[in-house]
């Protein structure tokens, strides 16, 4: 058993049929010694008396808010949550496996630049009685500070018969050094509580590996005289790290016909313009990627050819 | 050339070669070994590779103030990785395919380090990998980790040279 926060405790249980469970001793936070009784949740049934209560925790029915009273007055509470371990593996019932970039990916994180700011998100089908708490650091043995905000519900989607909820959190490294080569990864830890079930999820990454620039901005076409060719130009996204002579991007320019089956013409360039042939009803799209480190491409920025 | 006296390197040449290094480092990884990389090893497996850290002056401001600190750090790293790529981790079994980009990568590391420090000039003592023989069964994982680490190192070096070529070239 360990303390998650004041008066909230997590009991770690090996979860299998007829498991013996864990013996837990609760102590009433009071100077009183006599006349103390214990109850669980809203029940008035007295579970025991005395300053300590010993219980055998085996299932969710044994978890909940234990309260000690004296003469009708509440003295203190202890909330017991369960953390299940099945076949040596901690349960992951609360969050959905996003399966990207690999199986057992519950947390996904992205950064728009090298400033040390990043966003993580996760998915669940649970709509109520759900709380999240997020902590982060750089490195684990001698951790350096990363400050995370509160997790918020950022999107709701309907997937077949189910509703899916996306939560996200923004974090900022306290003393970020954008130009340095990271040697210690960022660690993100999410505590999830659904009713009386506790689970924790972690992710470890370098900012460089989660970089995904915003799409290029101000995408414009300029027809070239007496030609089917156009000059496409664009700019670095505002959110990208500066100076651009240091934090450079590379770009992919694509000409795509109306039909998805039509052949795509692609050009790669380090410049912020390119000359392409604009076909009727086609569109021109541009996306960006760090020039020197193959992290994710941005989403496409697009304009119609006409 | 970034000779220890403090004169400027051939920024544009360094930029071109460091960008080529980035491309090679990504094409060399993941290496096609004789088997899949099955186990994620612990972090103790690789030597303590040199990293370009916050105080090394490789940020735009630091380069403007005095690029020598940064260039020396990059040079140390290039020599370190060049030695790693020549060690039995890469020359031993499971053998690299004859057309593996590692050979080119190795030569380019040497080429860039020589651009930074021509024959006859010496910066202070290098950080050299302490290389005891690597067991064949460890090598695929070691290669994977070294190349991952090299990708990060050469990305920073390439940014330095790109910025230098754009803003510090005579």
């Amino acid at each position: 058993i360990w303390e998650l926060k004041k008066d909230v405790y997590v009991v770690e249980l090996d979860w299998y049929p007829d498991a013996p469970g864990e013996m837990v001793v609760l102590t009433c936070d009071t100077p009183e010694e006599d006349g103390i009784t214990w109850t669980l949740d809203q029940s008035s049934e007295v579970l025991g008396s005395g300053k300590t209560l010993t219980i055998q925790v085996k299932e969710f029915g044994d978890a909940g808010q234990y309260t000690c009273h004296k003469g009708g007055e509440v003295l203190s509470h202890s909330l017991l949550l369960l953390h299940k371990k099945e076949d040596g593996i901690w349960s992951t019932d609360i969050l959905k496996d996003q399966k990207e970039p690999k199986n057992k990916t519950f947390l996904r994180c992205e950064a728009k630049n090298y400033s040390g700011r990043f966003t993580c998100w996760w998915l669940t089908t649970i709509s109520t009685d759900l709380t999240f708490s997020v902590k982060s650091s750089r490195g684990s043995s001698d951790p350096q500070g990363v400050t995370c905000g509160a997790a918020t519900l950022s999107a709701e989607r309907v997937r077949g018969d189910n509703k899916e909820y996306e939560y996200s959190v923004e974090c900022q490294e306290d003393s970020a050094c954008p130009a340095a080569e990271e040697s210690l990864p960022i660690e993100v830890m999410v505590d999830a509580v659904h009713k009386l079930k506790y689970e924790n999820y972690t992710s470890s990454f370098f900012i460089r590996d989660i970089i995904k620039p915003d799409p290029p901005k101000n995408l414009q076409l300029k027809p070239l005289k007496n030609s089917r060719q156009v000059e496409v130009s664009w700019e670095y996204p505002d959110t990208w790290s500066t100076p651009h002579s240091y934090f450079s991007l590379t770009f992919c320019v694509q000409v795509q016909g109306k039909s998805k089956r039509e052949k795509k013409d692609r050009v790669f360039t380090d410049k912020t313009s390119a000359t392409v042939i604009c076909r009727k009803n086609a569109s021109i799209s541009v996306r960006a990627q760090d020039r020197y480190y193959s992290s994710s491409w941005s989403e496409w920025a697009s304009v119609p050819c006409s | 050339r970034a000779v220890p006296g403090g004169s400027s390197p051939a920024w544009t040449q360094c930029q071109q070669l460091s960008q080529k290094l980035c491309t090679l480092a990504w094409s060399a990884h993941p290496l096609v070994g004789h088997m899949d990389l099955r186990e994620e090893g612990d972090e103790e497996t690789t030597n303590d590779v040199p990293h370009i850290q916050c105080g090394d002056g490789c940020d735009p401001q630091g380069l403007r103030d005095n690029s020598q600190f940064c260039l020396q750090r990059i040079h140390q790293g290039l020599i370190f990785y060049e030695k790693l790529l020549g060690s039995d981790i890469f020359t031993g079994e499971p053998s690299l395919l004859p057309d593996s980009p590692v050979g080119q990568l190795h030569a380019s590391l040497l080429g860039l380090s020589q651009l930074l420090q021509p024959e006859g000039h010496h910066w202070e003592t290098q950080q050299i990998p302490s290389l005891s023989p690597s067991q064949p069964w460890q090598r695929l994982l070691l290669r994977f980790k070294i190349l991952r680490s090299l990708q990060a190192f050469v990305a920073v070096a390439a940014r330095v040279f790109a910025h230098g070529a754009a803003t510090l070239s005579p």
Epitope: - | G92, Q135, P136
Partner: antibody, heavy 116, light 107 residues
Framework: EVQLQQSGPELVKPGASVKMSCKAS????????MHWVKQKPGQGLEWIGY????????NYNEKFKGKATLTSDKSSSTAYMELSSLTSEDSAVYYC?????????WGQGTTLTVSS | DIVMTQSPATLSVTPGDRVSLSCRAS??????LHWYQQKSHESPRLLIK???QSISGIPSRFSGSGSGSDFTLSINSVEPEDVGVYYC?????????FGSGTKLEIK
């Protein structure tokens, strides 16, 4: 075509030393390890050690430490093995071999006879 | 050291037979196992690498299988020129060790 050409047979007296060579051609000498293997008459194969010609790093079978010394010369793409304090137990055929898993290139062997 | 045990020590076969040579390692060596053929007065020749990978120029009748500590070299239709001693080799860890060999004879 990859070839490993070993030096000719040696007849030496007990207590003496001998240095045999293995000249590599048809590939980049510094790109692979060079192993050395011992085979006593009518017996099996025993690994002595290897040299990495790129950095002259060596790795020996404990059994041959102090007995064998591996060196190489990049300029001539040649690997060498010196055997010291020779006894009749050292009489054998000695092979050089490039990385085991690349085409299995072995030299033709150098026969060493130790006899008074 | 990893001990490589080969069986049988000698195998007498008729041309056209399918034969299996066994090699056992004293501890797991994953698939880091190589097979060699050595004919009289010749250098060893690599037949199979990494337990089952074929080598160019080696006839397709030679195949390998196994992983961990048990390995097999199969010759699916023995030819008279296949006589010689067959060695397996631990390529997993130092010191590299060879089996004592299986001598293949033609009846």
């Amino acid at each position: 075509e990859v070839q490993l050409q070993q030096s000719g047979p040696e007849l030496v007296k007990p207590g003496a030393s001998v240095k045999m060579s293995c000249k590599a051609s048809g590939y980049t000498f510094t790109r692979y390890l060079m192993h050395w293997v011992k085979q006593k008459p009518g017996q099996g194969l025993e690994w002595i050690g290897y040299i990495n010609p790129y950095n002259d790093g060596t790795n020996y079978n404990e059994k041959f430490k102090g007995k064998a010394t591996l060196t190489s010369d990049k300029s001539s793409s040649t690997a060498y093995m010196e055997l010291s304090s020779l006894t009749s137990e050292d009489s054998a055929v000695y092979y050089c071999a490039r990385n085991w898993d690349v085409g299995g290139y072995w030299g033709q062997g150098t026969t060493l006879t130790v006899s008074s | 050291d990893i001990v490589m045990t080969q069986s049988p020590a000698t195998l007498s076969v008729t041309p056209g037979d399918r034969v299996s040579l066994s090699c056992r390692a004293s501890q797991s060596i994953s698939d880091y196992l190589h097979w060699y053929q050595q004919k009289s007065h010749e250098s060893p020749r690599l037949l199979i690498k990494y337990a089952s990978q074929s080598i160019s120029g080696i006839p397709s009748r030679f195949s390998g299988s196994g992983s961990g500590s048990d390995f097999t070299l199969s010759i699916n239709s023995v030819e008279p020129e296949d006589v010689g001693v067959y060695y397996c080799q631990n390529g997993h860890s130092f010191p590299f060790t060879f089996g004592s060999g299986t001598k293949l004879e033609i009846k």
